[in-house]
């Protein structure tokens, strides 16, 4: 398969400039005010110094103004996500001005040339904003720049060059190549707006990272760790198109940031919450589900303004499609003894039973190892709202599913052929809901039976004293 390069291209493609023409090419940036929810409508073009289109097209000086800034393009046409985002903004903010920044001629270049054009496009947007500020009632505080990929850094330049401070910049998977590790004035950064929030959906620690890995905003949200997005695997992509390629996977994961933002606009009754954490591994362990001291936030449009002294990295899990919201649970399992564990880690599954619904069988991901006489923390998440939890079924999977584990089991058997059965003792499970911040303790149904072994299950019910809710802040945030 070809090596992916960008949102819709391959590494070798970037070496080919679009064909030269005999027609003079204007290095142009256009501002298209989307005056209708109908995506086919041509809209109104705004230009600095020309006030008539503002009147003719009913530009609302007192309303919010969104500028949507696309990224690098190999086709020279707007990508299909654009009118989804325009439509979602119109649906959510009926009186708002939605402006599409068309810099296609400058983006339809070698990637390196498009990167070098970001500064001039940022200048153009800043000039437009400076001109609009001369009008009565127009406030820079009402301006929200939304930039995708390379467009996120264009937004950063615009925020940097404008006279004053724009209200908000949202970076949707800001481009990585040529920006990773760059000086703050040469990329999107927190000082480019009053509030800079960022969604990272295609970051890779190996190979080429299409999206930037480093935090570049006041809050930087890494859905699913910021790398492998559900529904974007080769198998998923192959299922939806006949000739699925790595390129399609790249596009799916990179573009997921846009869809998460659209979801936050149109499904505001199903907000997704992210939780502050130092890294993805700690989040996967379930350690970071706190909402104390602004440690959690809504993602996308509904994000609550947070201006931290340091970048705040936040994590969450999502579904494979809209609505993306899942329900996160921290599970603390205290293992107070175990027998004959050998070399291999157990494979545990839990099923949660609630007042609204029951979960599917959920795997407990062991990030490091099961510790004895210690509390082991896990993250599980469900796609449906289970309501109040009533009971938990913990299952230790019997037969090994991996050849590696099977080999270790076999080796363990050879060295200790009469090894008695492996066994763990668990008395209680403490559960915390990320979404409600409620904490519950579950005890084994039979206090005498606390042991679990491969192929067996253990049932837990709410302990008699087990309905506890610590005085923590719930993540419900005020919508903007």
């Amino acid at each position: 398969s070809p090596v992916p390069f960008g949102p819709e291209g391959r590494l070798e493609d970037k070496l080919h400039k679009p064909k030269a023409t005999q027609t003079e090419v204007k290095p142009s940036v256009r501002f298209n005010l989307r005056t209708s929810k109908d995506p086919e409508h041509e809209g109104c073009y705004l230009s600095v110094g020309h006030s008539q289109p503002l009147e003719d097209c009913s530009f609302n000086m007192t309303a919010k103004t969104f500028f949507i800034i696309h990224g690098w393009t190999m086709s020279g046409i707007f990508e299909n996500w654009l009118h989804k985002l325009v439509s979602a903004l119109h649906t959510r903010e009926k009186d708002a001005n939605v402006v599409v920044v068309d810099w296609l001629p400058l983006a339809h270049q070698l990637y390196t040339d498009a990167v070098n054009n970001t500064r001039v496009v940022g200048h153009s947007i800043a000039r437009m904003l400076d001109w609009l500020q001369e009008k009565d009632d127009f406030s820079l505080g009402n301006v929200h720049l939304i930039g995708y990929s390379l467009g996120a850094h264009v937004a950063g330049y615009a925020g940097n060059f404008v006279k004053g401070t724009v209200g908000r910049i949202t970076g949707l998977d800001p481009a990585g190549p040529m920006f990773e590790g760059a000086d703050i004035h040469k990329r999107l950064s927190p000082d480019d707006a009053d509030f800079v929030d960022v969604l990272h959906t295609y970051t890779r620690s190996f190979g080429l990272s299409i999206g930037i890995q480093m935090p570049v905003g006041h809050i930087d949200i890494y859905p699913n760790g910021g790398d492998f997005q559900p529904g974007c695997g080769l198998n998923d992509v192959l299922g939806s198109i006949a000739y699925g390629t790595i390129t399609e996977v790249v596009k799916c994961e990179h573009e997921r940031a846009v869809h998460l933002f659209v979801d936050s606009l149109v499904n505001q009754d199903k907000p997704s919450f992210a939780f502050q954490c130092t890294d993805s591994n700690r989040f996967k362990k379930g350690i970071c589900l706190s909402c104390r001291k602004n440690r959690c936030n809504s993602i996308g449009y509904n994000a609550k303004k947070m201006r931290n002294k340091r970048n705040s990295k936040m994590y969450l899990k999502t579904r494979a499609g809209m609505p993306f919201r899942v329900y996160h649970y921290q599970m603390k399992i205290h293992v107070f003894s175990y027998k004959n564990m050998g070399e291999i880690e157990p494979t545990f599954y839990v099923t949660l039973y609630g007042t609204n619904a029951d979960s599917q069988t959920l795997p407990l991901e062991i990030v490091e190892r099961i510790e004895q006489n210690a509390t082991n923390t896990f993250l599980v998440y469900t796609e449906e709202d289970l309501g109040d939890l009533l009971k938990i079924q913990l299952t230790w999977e019997g037969a090994s599913q991996s050849w590696y584990n099977l080999w270790k089991e076999f080796r363990s058997y050879l060295s200790q052929p009469r090894n008695p059965g492996r066994e763990l003792n668990i008395r209680r499970i403490r559960v915390k809901s990320g979404e409600t911040q409620r904490k519950l303790t579950f005890c084994t149904e039979d206090p005498e039976n606390t042991s679990i072994s491969p192929g067996r299950e253990l049932w837990f019910r709410k302990c008699r004293d087990g309905w506890r809710m610590k005085n923590e802040t719930s993540p419900t945030v005020e919508l903007p």
Partner: antibody, heavy 120, light 111 residues
């Protein structure tokens, strides 16, 4: 009303060049892209490429790179298709068709077509 | 490039009857809930004319006898009831990605 008016039929010898024009009226020329479509006798429709009428940047489909050039004169809202080193297989009807920059990009307005015949 | 396969290649229908043309794409032409599939009618000696856009939306001035349906890779154009002046070639087109491609066409004749 919105219309695209194309230049008249052309009879050319192999090796010659031809320039077909497409004049737009009834709308803002630079607000829509201009596409070129070829239809050989008794055949289907074949997209040749398009030109961004604001920036002047052309994009050519795979089979139309080299001898085919799209250009503009925005002052008279006109797009041009020039074919050089004509061959017998270039004999076809050439259509211009506009498409929006936004939305689903279908071709909502077509010119009547220009027949180019290449014969010795 | 996305390949569009139309069937049948030709069709003879009596006035008042229903004509159905199908178009199969080599990969999905849907984006979210939108289908980037369109239908054109081309009468002899005339340019193509837009009939249906986005799979099922009737273009301006097109009679309601024409309808479109489908999603993903399978789309249908239906003419019901067929009239004498519907003799033409009908083409499907996808615009989900460049290059936009056309089906091979279906010739509809009225008996």
């Amino acid at each position: 009303q919105v219309q695209l008016v194309q230049s008249g039929s052309e009879l050319k010898k192999p090796g010659a060049s031809v320039k077909v024009s497409c004049k737009a009226s009834g709308y803002t020329f630079t607000n829509y892209g201009m596409n070129w479509v070829r239809q050989a006798p008794g055949q289907g429709l074949e997209w040749m490429g398009w030109i961004n009428t604001y920036s002047g940047v052309p994009t050519y489909a795979g089979d139309f790179k080299g001898r085919f050039v799209f250009s503009l004169d925005t002052s008279v809202s006109t797009a041009y298709l020039q074919i050089s080193s004509l061959k017998a297989e270039d004999t076809a009807v050439y259509y211009c068709a506009r498409r929006g920059y936004y939305g689903r990009r279908y071709f909502d307005v077509w010119g009547k077509g220009t027949t180019v015949t290449v014969s010795s | 490039d996305i390949v569009l396969t139309q069937s049948p290649a030709s069709l003879a229908v009596s006035p008042g009857q229903r004509a159905t043309i199908t178009c199969k794409a080599s990969q999905s032409v849907d984006y979210d809930v939108d289908s980037y599939m369109h239908w054109y009618q081309q009468k002899p000696g005339q340019p193509p004319k837009l009939l249906i856009y986005a799979a099922s939306n009737l273009a301006s001035g097109v009679p309601a006898r024409f309808s479109g349906s489908g999603s993903g890779t399978d789309f249908t154009l239906t003419i019901n009831p067929v009239e004498a002046n519907d003799t033409a070639n009908y083409y499907c087109q996808q615009t989900i990605e460049d290059p936009p491609t056309f089906g091979g066409g279906t010739k509809v004749e009225i008996k």
